[in-house]
């Protein structure tokens, strides 16, 4: 009679994470008598996966009834597969011995590859806000996928970006992989409503890529422009001066009126109007009693936006002139740093 052969008909098996892997194995003879064992890997460090004779292997089930006398099918099923299960599995026939069974013949091995989906991409931007015309970095990370081949793309408002660098780790063989990409994005004054999207395509996703997004509203700071104008007189001795604060984002803004350098009123932007591009406009007014001033008055609208150094604009109110409307004086903007006295 021909010597027993252990046949593993599948050189490789590909299974999606979470599913069940079937590893096929048949023997060509019932002799010699002895159990079958399954191992992952070869050599002294191999890992026992299933022992027909003894042990508890909750994830493993046999395809046929191994207790039947004439059974020669030693195929197994491994449930709830994870990337950690990847490797080469050997079906090994043992000959009954005393005191221990002796390894008789091994199958050629079946390589189990696990297809694992990448995790949802996580996109993160800079630690602090940046102003328009600056280039900032966004990172995208996704983990736990297998096989290693993966495609990552970046988009800003649907337009594909080209300035990015991507790494897949580790470089060598591994049960699963991670991807890390950094894209450079140029901010514009119109980017409050913009989105940066990281798109990951992988064989496990059946053509339906995963996307991670970041809203540029979390990243951008649009500085305001200021305009101080004098309105027509309300009464003989009263002049209305307005400060228009335009095109700013985010909304956090505090405005202070100063008369000849002395604080007159401080207020916080509340009832702002929103522009189409997501930036805000706000207007504050100051009623000045001209008769209370003997000399010309320097009115300053000082704005502190989103914790930045104060920006200001001044208007010279001529007291000597008859109180009629005067043109706006687009004097000073920008007081520099918070620690400085601008007057």
């Amino acid at each position: 009679e021909e010597e027993l052969q252990v046949i593993q008909p599948d050189k490789s098996v590909l299974v999606a994470a979470g599913e069940t892997a079937t590893l096929r194995c048949t023997a060509t003879s019932l002799i010699p008598v002895g159990p079958i064992q399954w191992f992952r890997g070869a050599g002294p460090g191999r890992e026992l996966i299933y022992n027909q004779k003894e042990g508890h292997f909750p994830r493993v089930t046999t395809v046929s009834d191994l207790t039947k006398r004439n059974n020669m099918d030693f195929s197994i099923r491994i449930g709830n597969i994870t990337p950690a299960d990847a490797g080469t599995y050997y079906c090994v026939k043992f000959r009954k011995g005393s005191p221990d069974d002796v390894e008789f013949k091994s199958g050629a091995g079946t390589e189990l590859s696990v297809r694992a989906k990448p995790s949802a991409p996580v996109v993160s931007g800079p630690a602090a806000r940046a102003t328009p015309q600056h280039t900032v970095s966004f990172t995208c990370e996704s983990h736990g996928f297998s096989p290693r081949d993966i495609t990552l793309k970046w988009f800003k408002n649907g337009n594909e970006l080209s300035d990015f660098q991507t790494n897949v780790d580790p470089v060598g063989e591994s049960v699963s992989y991670s991807i890390h990409s950094t894209a450079k994005v140029v901010l514009t004054r119109e980017d409050v409503h913009s989105q940066v999207i990281c798109e990951v395509a992988h064989v496990t996703l059946q053509g339906d890529p995963l996307r991670g997004t970041a809203n540029l509203s979390e990243t951008i700071r649009v500085p305001p422009t200021l305009e101080v104008t004098q309105q027509p007189v309300r009464a003989e001795n009263q002049v209305n001066v307005t400060c228009q604060v335009r095109k700013f984002y985010p909304q956090r803004l505090q405005l202070t009126w100063l008369e000849n350098g002395n604080v007159s009123r401080t207020e916080t932007a509340s009832t702002v109007t929103e522009n189409k591009d997501g930036t805000y406009n706000w207007m504050s007014w100051l009623l000045v009693n001209v008769s209370a001033h003997r000399d010309d008055v320097k009115l300053t609208c000082q704005v502190e936006h989103d914790g930045q150094p104060a920006v200001s604009k001044s208007h010279d109110l001529k007291v000597s002139a008859h109180p009629k409307e005067q043109g706006s004086n687009t004097a000073a903007e920008n007081t520099g740093s918070n620690e400085r006295n601008i007057y």
Partner: antibody, heavy 119, light 107 residues
Framework: QVQLVQSGAEVKKPGASVKVSCKAS????????IHWVRQAPGQGLEWMGD????????ANNQKFKGRVTMTADTSTSTVYMELSSLRSEDTAVYYC????????????WGQGTLVTVSS | DIQMTQSPSSLSASVGDRVTITCKAS??????VAWYQQKPGKAPKLLIY???SLETGVPSRFSGSGSGTDFTFTISSLQPEDIATYYC?????????FGGGTKVEIK
Amino acid sequence: QVQLVQSGAEVKKPGASVKVSCKASGYTFTDYEIHWVRQAPGQGLEWMGDIHPGSGGTANNQKFKGRVTMTADTSTSTVYMELSSLRSEDTAVYYCTRAVSGYYAMDYWGQGTLVTVSS
Amino acid sequence: DIQMTQSPSSLSASVGDRVTITCKASEDIYDRVAWYQQKPGKAPKLLIYGTASLETGVPSRFSGSGSGTDFTFTISSLQPEDIATYYCQQYWTTPWTFGGGTKVEIK
């Protein structure tokens, strides 16, 4: 008080790179941008670019076609400007300056670093 | 890039004279204009920002005005220590650009 202290003069050969440092003190380093401006002998001022140490955001003058790299080390409050592929026309005094983009002009300047490119 | 055309390139005036320098931008820069003074061998010094704001510690004889594309820098009464080169600069759009400079001398 606000101070920007730059590294010393450099002499480089054409094709080489130079890295100029600018150490900031007297203010919150991550709140302000550091800009780089150069001035060739007897010439005017030319803006090269800036970096915001807080956000890592940068803006560059495209004239330099990627030859300028700016980095910031928040642990030492130092900004570095590296200019590569040097040519003789890069001979200039290089200044680092402080500003708040969109809000404020360049209010404090370093003492300048003379970079001479000569074969 | 926004061009800043500064004129004149040089001027000579007497102590006490009123000196005016103009700067024309190639496009609207709102009021993001600064003026700097540079003395030989020294770094530039900020005098005026936001078109008309006087930097802290700068004498009140220096002033600025204008908006949009046309800007003016004035020294109301020229002093011997004002001998320097003056530059305008826009900081509305990158790349930030400077005027060519005006060298001011005493007659």
